[in-house]
């Protein structure tokens, strides 16, 4: 004959452990069931009734299936240097990642506790290490031969124009100047960037206004600087 | 654009119920309470109650519990109000507001508010 | 039920003042959970400050908040012509959700 089905709560056999989604409750010394994602235990178990759950209070969550007194608290809301990658739901916490020109400089389980402006090299330096999401940029003086002109996160040192005839010879920060006007390089002009690190949040240019004054998909339609590095600059 | 637009004034008798309603535009039902607070004559504001309309789970000051009934229609995007024995001290305006679950509770929108006098 | 209660029920300032409400809860509120409306005469209140000391896209820079635990408060450092209205600070740590009384700033 089929084993007889449990149903919670029920005392386990003996060196037996708790069905997938129950736990073991000391107190009533039954195996009871567990609460899904988004809900806490209101009542716990007894010998004769099972767990009541109920569903988490505002700005709380829980992501596990779980039998905690109270879901948690939701953290703060991001601030204007970050972007809300995931909301705060009741199964889910927020999560906040810097926006774009920023890097994370104390990241926490999930997403950024602070983050930073990415530096800046300034003319006379280059980028030689890009920044990510949890590095800053590290900037290089211009090596002979090349330059840089702007105060960037993502320009690199370019080389100098080649001169038939120099007028004024180029420097780690300016470009040669050529009498002729001609010059022998073929290289385009224009600055050379490097990319922004990838990210897979949405790249918004400006810092996220706060809170909720911007429609939230909410309600019934049905519808600190990094101190600056040798050749850096801050913002 | 989000809006909160609430039905007319009312005049009321002591003893009789009223309803106020509260249509919502411009966002939808997920995640978000909907929440009732009252201003009398010259008074502050009193939180009266809250509903989630997705679920229809509803909250209230217990000195509201047996007063106010809170519920909502999301297939025409309306939250109500419904306040039972009026009397005279139940002159007030109702305001609805709405708050974005994660927010803490900061109601964000208001609708414009409805007058209800209970007068003899 | 947490009480709130605001300091000082109404004053009276000029414009360009520097004015501080203050806001004092009976047992202790999460800063996330503490926020300030703005309301006028026949108007809907208006979220002026939320979680303590954020302020909502549209709200001049002059209002600010700070404060923690039972004691918190709403500056405005340079009241001007439009800043005259009722204030009101709200907790939501604990139902009932209660507001403070409301604190009237008049043209002195």
């Known amino acids: 004959l089929p084993a007889q089905v449990a149903f919670t709560p029920y005392a386990p056999e003996p060196g037996s452990t708790c069905r997938l989604r129950e736990y073991y409750d000391q107190t009533a010394q039954m195996c009871c069931s567990k609460c899904s994602p988004g809900q806490h235990a209101k009542v716990f178990c007894t010998k004769t009734s099972d767990t009541v759950c109920d569903s988490c209070e505002d700005s709380t969550y829980t992501q596990l299936w779980n039998w905690v007194p109270e879901c948690l608290s939701c953290g703060s809301r991001c601030s204007s240097d970050q972007v809300e990658t995931q909301a705060c739901t009741r199964e889910q916490n927020r999560i906040c990642t810097c926006r774009p020109g920023w890097y994370c400089a104390l990241s926490k389980q999930e997403g950024c506790r602070l983050c930073a402006p990415l530096r800046k090299c300034r003319p006379g330096f280059g980028v030689a290490r890009p920044g990510t999401e949890t590095s800053d940029v590290v900037c290089k003086p211009c090596a002979p031969g090349t330059f840089s002109n702007t105060t960037s996160s993502t320009d690199i040192c370019r080389p100098h124009q080649i001169c038939n005839v120099v007028a004024i010879p180029g420097n780690a920060s300016m470009d040669a100047v050529c009498t002729s006007t001609s010059p022998t390089r073929s290289m385009a002009p224009g600055a050379v960037h490097l990319p922004q690190p990838v990210s897979t949040r949405s790249q918004h240019t400006q810092p996220t206004p706060e809170p909720s004054t911007a429609p939230s998909t909410s309600f019934l339609l049905p519808m600190g600087p990094s101190p600056p590095a040798e050749g850096s600059t801050g913002d | 654009q989000v809006q909160l637009v609430q039905s007319g004034s009312e005049l009321k008798k002591p003893g009789a119920s009223v309803k106020v309603s509260c249509k919502a535009s411009?966002?939808?039902?997920?995640?978000?309470?909907m929440h009732w607070v009252r201003q009398a004559p010259g008074q502050g504001l009193e939180w009266m109650g809250r509903i989630d309309p997705a679920t229809g789970n509803t909250k209230h000051d217990p000195k509201f519990q047996d007063k106010a009934v809170l519920s909502s229609d999301t297939s025409v995007s309306t939250a109500y109000l419904q306040i039972s024995s009026l009397k005279a001290e139940d002159t007030a305006v109702y305001y609805c507001?709405?708050?974005?679950?994660?927010?803490?509770?900061?109601?964000?929108?208001w609708g414009q508010g409805t007058l209800v006098t209970v007068s003899s | 039920d947490i009480q709130m209660t605001q300091s000082p029920s109404s004053l009276s300032a000029s414009v360009g003042d520097r004015v501080t409400i203050t806001c004092t809860a009976s047992?202790?509120?999460?800063?996330?959970?503490l926020h300030w409306y703005q309301q006028k005469p026949g108007k809907a209140p208006k979220l002026l400050i939320y979680s303590t000391s954020n302020l909502p896209s549209g709200v001049p820079s002059r209002f600010s908040g700070s404060g923690s635990g039972t004691d918190y408060s709403l500056t405005i450092s340079s009241l001007q012509p439009e800043d005259f209205a009722t204030y009101y600070c709200h907790q939501y740590h604990r139902s009932p959700w209660t507001f403070g009384q409301g604190t009237k700033v008049e043209i002195k």
């Open positions: 047992s202790s509120v999460s800063s996330n959970y």
């Open positions: 411009g966002f939808n039902n997920k995640d978000i309470y």
């Open positions: 507001a709405r708050s974005p679950y994660g927010d803490f509770g900061a109601m964000d929108y």
